[in-house]
Interface confidence: low
């Protein structure tokens, strides 16, 4: 009986035409959201003027569909047994899930000018950013609608830098008709334990970002993992989002419409610093903000970011240490809401339910130069929002799971 | 093998339409992203536009927004092309085309005459 399933289970888990692997991995069977959560700044002016702690009021959730759409050129290597793939983006607002609507206005850092400033240090540089920030009535906050936000806005401080600069500015700017990849990943036809990992990812292994083992590309896409997993399993996957590949470890045992599977979570070890975990020394890769390399909870991307000063954390800077929250009121970081955590089937290592949590942040220094950064007294991370990402597998799919998979072990 | 196969060229009037359309085999045409290409003679080959694969979203050059659409039919396995307001610098060959991520390849058909004439 169970070497039969194993069998049966093997040639379904394997990532070609025909089998139920295949059909679920081009396209998804399950409704995935993002939902956004926006800090609103409260004290704007405080902050410019005085260099106080930042009062931040988050507001949420707004929601989007996303990951709707199939993978596109997907196309099998029988040689080395891998297939090839774009994920393309897209997002679609879902208002009946929102709080508000995507025209709602924020106040948030001005995304442009704290860039701006941390990617042109020289002096001579800086002065003429300030009189075009000035001339373009430009500020250290800006109010922004969500969209604008979000998907992209044309900035008006550089629109007037004389050389040739992006213009448009957005957290997620370009998304709708761009596709993450190119992905190959091994196809599992010649060895089950390797389907769904990535072998490469833009053509490369590695990544060019970070020193050491901390660049390379580990694991699968987290979307599954290859079949029969363990408990005692640390689960790697890669995640474009945060610029780097990172694990999860299992927590406990959970039933999921009536499918056993096991919860993995990313342990806080995972965002700890060099000095708690030796691994994460190539993660730390400038010695001022990091406090040489003893703050924690944040990881710095600008190498991912085209420069741009963003860092990435939990949601509330959920296991990262005090002195990065120190500067910022209104954070109330808790586990229950704010880790990330994958749902796994065992049997076939399929996800049937993750929600991934993070948090995009942006580095704000004090410049003699640009006077609306002039009265800053202390750097700042500035948390511009957090999403949460989950998809569930529907009840169809799970009725589907439990008389082919599951019940056919039990 | 992966073939395309273009049709619908010919002599049109300034100001006139065509379409094109291109037959595709030997892929699953659904999971691929489709583009229309052309060379005018004497010049180098050039984007026209393209069409992701659910036919959601298509991209032109401006030389040809607001007068070119591409569309697909999925279920014919065909990709078109429709020519409005043709002007006389539209003249070319033009090809249809696709690729696959890996192995790294193009592919085209054999081209489709199209001549504007004044």
């Known amino acids: 009986g169970d070497l039969l399933i194993q069998k049966t289970i093997k040639k379904q888990v394997v990532l070609e035409e025909g089998t139920i692997a295949f059909k679920n991995w081009v396209k998804t069977g399950t409704e995935v959201y993002r939902q956004f959560w926006i800090f609103d700044v409260q004290n704007p002016q405080e902050v410019m003027m005085n260099s106080s702690n930042i009062q931040v009021k988050q507001r949420g959730p707004y929601t989007y569909r996303v990951r709707f759409l199939a993978k596109e050129n997907v196309t099998q290597d029988a040689e080395d047994n891998t297939v090839s793939f774009l994920q393309p983006n897209g997002a679609i607002f879902e208002p009946s899930l929102s709080v508000g609507t995507e025209a709602d206005n924020f106040t948030v850092l001005n995304l442009a000018v704290a860039a701006a400033s941390h990617i042109y240090q020289n002096q001579f540089v800086q002065m003429i950013l300030n009189s075009l920030i000035n001339k373009s009535k430009s500020s250290m906050f800006q109010v922004r609608t969500l969209r604008e936000l979000l998907w992209g806005y044309r900035d008006p401080f550089l629109s007037l830098v004389p050389y040739p600069v992006t213009t448009t500015v957005g957290l997620f700017y370009p998304y709708n008709n761009t596709a993450d990849g190119v992905y190959k990943v091994f196809n599992g036809k010649d060895n089950i334990s390797k389907v769904a990992i990535i072998d490469t990812y833009k053509g490369k292994r590695n990544l060019s970002y970070w020193e050491s083992h901390c660049d390379m590309i580990n694991g699968t896409d987290a979307a599954s993992f290859p079949p029969f997993v363990e408990k005692s399993q640390v689960l790697q996957f890669f995640s474009s989002d945060i610029c780097r590949s990172i694990y999860a470890v299992f927590e406990s045992d959970v039933n999921l419409k009536g499918i056993p599977v096991y919860r993995f979570v990313l342990p806080s070890k995972a965002f700890a610093s060099p000095v708690e975990n030796p691994d994460n020394y190539c993660f730390c890769t400038e010695k001022i903000i990091s406090k040489n390399c003893t703050s924690y909870g944040v990881l710095d991307i600008s190498k991912c970011k085209e420069g741009r000063p963003v860092y990435i954390s939990l949601p509330h800077f959920l296991y990262a240490s005090p002195d990065v929250s120190e500067p910022i009121d209104g954070l109330n970081p808790n586990e229950e809401e704010h880790r990330t955590y994958l749902d796994i089937e065992p049997i076939t290592g399929f996800t049937l339910q993750f929600a991934k949590r993070l948090q995009v942040n942006l580095l704000v220094k004090p410049s003699e130069k640009i006077q609306v950064l002039k009265n800053l007294k202390r750097n700042y991370i500035v948390p511009i929002l957090w999403l949460n990402e989950t998809g569930t597998i529907g009840d169809e799919k799970a009725n589907m799971f439990r008389s082919q998979v599951t019940g056919k072990i039990n | 093998q992966v073939q395309l196969q273009e049709s619908g060229g010919g002599l049109v009037q300034l100001g006139g339409s065509l379409r094109l359309s291109c037959a595709a085999s030997?892929?699953?045409?659904?999971?691929?992203?489709m583009s229309w290409y052309r060379q005018a003679p004497g010049k180098e080959r050039e984007l026209v536009g393209g069409?992701?694969?659910?036919?959601?979203?298509?991209d032109y050059v401006d030389s040809v927004k607001g007068r070119f659409t591409i569309s697909r039919d999925n279920t014919k396995n065909t990709v078109y092309l429709q020519m409005n307001s043709l002007r006389v610098e539209d003249t070319a060959v033009y090809y249809c085309?696709?690729?696959?991520?890996?192995?790294?390849?193009?592919?085209w058909g054999q081209g489709t005459q199209v001549t504007v004439s004044s």
């Open positions: 030997g892929f699953t045409f659904s999971n691929y992203y």
């Open positions: 085309h696709t690729f696959s991520v890996w192995p790294p390849n193009n592919y």
């Open positions: 069409i992701n694969m659910t036919g959601g979203s298509a």
